[in-house]
Interface confidence: low
């Protein structure tokens, strides 16, 4: 259940590295429960750490991805998990730490290839219990405390949509994430063909507003399905 996943003991007992730092902005990975690590505005221990529930990667920090914390666990229970370092297993780009991307099921350096043009590759192999250490996490940055007290306006930098003011969501623009307007009726939206494909977007759009869904424009006829325009429409 959700409660058991959010229980601190459940988090502590997750297999490393998934239990290391499950989704606090700017957090460094801790090797064992009780070790201090930077999380948000103050230092916290794993013992009192509360993970961040999520539905998709965009709701997590730049150094995080959204997934079920346990192998073969309840797919409906997802939290923000620490990104995967170089040479670690992955299933999509968002799982890999900044400067890396997912290729053939492994996080590799984006310096090695033109990774933005790559097509995501799906792997069927499940995660092993590969133990991550603290190395490679030195690039994690903490946001100023101001971020947590004032909601970001349009164009403000953010880690997740909850950092943004009402009517805005947190979406990628190049490799930064900023607050953008939630889409209104009639506005062009992005329809993802398969789960996880949003990880390839350099310029993410927000989702459609309440009562709207992203659908093919009825009067928009193109030669191929791939070029059809999607807009936010009433349910």
């Amino acid at each position: 259940t959700l409660n058991s996943v959010l229980n601190s003991n459940a988090i502590k007992n997750l297999p490393p590295p998934l239990g290391g730092a499950a989704g606090h902005p700017g957090s460094a990975v801790s090797a064992a429960p009780g070790i201090l690590y930077p999380g948000g505005n103050k230092y916290q221990t794993i013992d009192n750490y509360q993970p961040y529930p999520c539905a998709e990667d965009e709701e997590c920090g730049t150094d995080e991805y959204c997934a079920s914390p346990t192998r073969g666990g309840d797919a409906g229970v997802q939290i923000c998990l620490a990104c995967r370092k170089r040479r670690k297993r992955c299933m999509r780009h968002a799982m890999c730490c900044p400067g890396n991307y997912c290729k053939n099921g492994i996080c590799v350096s984006s310096d090695q290839n033109h990774f933005r043009g790559e097509i995501e590759e799906t792997i069927t192999e499940s995660f092993g219990n590969d133990h991550s250490t603290l190395d490679g996490y030195s690039r994690r940055t903490t946001l100023s405390s101001k971020m947590y007290h004032t909601k970001g306006q349009e164009g403000s930098v953010c880690l997740r949509s909850s950092d943004c003011a009402s009517g805005l969501c947190c979406a990628r623009h190049f490799w930064s994430k900023i607050c953008k307007p939630v889409l209104k009726e009639g506005q062009v939206c992005t329809k993802h063909r398969r789960k996880g494909s949003h990880g390839l977007e350099i310029f993410q759009r927000c989702y459609c507003g309440e009562g709207l869904s992203c659908r093919i424009q009825k009067d928009h006829h193109q030669a191929s399905n791939s070029s059809r325009l999607h807009t936010c429409q009433r349910h």
Epitope: P98, G99, H114, L143, H173, F174, W175, S176, F203, R205
Partner: antibody, heavy 116, light 108 residues
């Protein structure tokens, strides 16, 4: 108030080097990818380079690849462009910019003239 | 490398609607951003992510993007809209930012 101020431009001979700086203020510089864009006199905009918010990756336009180096010092809120082996065709106004959607800011530019 | 094609010039009478196009191979799959640049000034973003508009830009400016063409539409054109307009995309295959050649909008 967001400000980007370029400096370091001037007249330089072909084959020589120049280093441009861009001082940023009014926003959290370390959280944004930064770009250099140039514009030759009477011509259109030409992208030069991008550096990720944390400096981890850099990409360059083909005409400057191997000659120009983009870098940043987040502790000083400053973006740099080291230009080596300058050519006459590098003559342009050089802008630093965030190019970040609604948070899109440009400096006023600094003129680089490569002439013998 | 990816190429964006704009008409060199577009002319329109005050109060009319101006449409500036930006052509590129399957540009509809990319996010397009539009800039306005007046002489001696730095460019100013007028539309981003195809159709979103910065809060300080008038509603007269709008954008669309589909197939092989993106379009910047300026309704009820004013004399102050006279400027050069550039489209811009990120080309993921080369990891480059690409600008169109620019379009000079003349208000008759």
């Amino acid at each position: 108030q967001v400000q980007l101020v370029e400096s370091g431009g001037g007249v330089v001979q072909p084959g020589r080097s120049l280093r441009l700086s861009c001082a940023a203020s009014g926003f959290t510089f370390s959280r944004y990818d930064m770009h250099w864009v140039r514009q030759a006199p009477g011509k259109g905009l030409e992208w030069v380079a991008i550096i990720f918010y944390d400096g981890s990756n850099k990409y360059y336009a083909d005409p400057v690849k191997g000659r120009f180096t983009i870098s940043r010092d987040n502790s000083k809120n400053t973006l740099y462009l080291q230009m080596n082996s300058l050519r006459a065709e590098d003559t342009a106004v050089y802008y630093c910019a965030t190019l970040a959607a609604a948070f899109d800011y440009w400096g006023q530019g600094t003129l680089v003239t490569v002439s013998s | 490398s990816y190429v964006l094609t704009q008409p060199p010039s577009v002319s329109v009478a005050p109060g009319q609607t101006a449409r500036i196009t930006c052509g590129g191979n399957n540009i509809g799959s990319k996010s397009v951003h539009w800039y306005q640049q007046k002489p001696g000034q730095a460019p100013v973003l007028v539309v981003y992510d195809d159709s979103d508009r910065p809060s300080e830009i008038p509603e007269r400016f709008s954008g669309s993007n589909s197939g092989n063409t993106a379009t910047l539409t300026i309704s009820r054109v004013e004399a102050g809209d006279e400027a050069d307009y550039y489209c811009q995309v990120w080309d993921s295959s080369s990891d480059h930012v690409v600008f169109g050649g620019g379009t000079r909008l003349t208000v008759l």
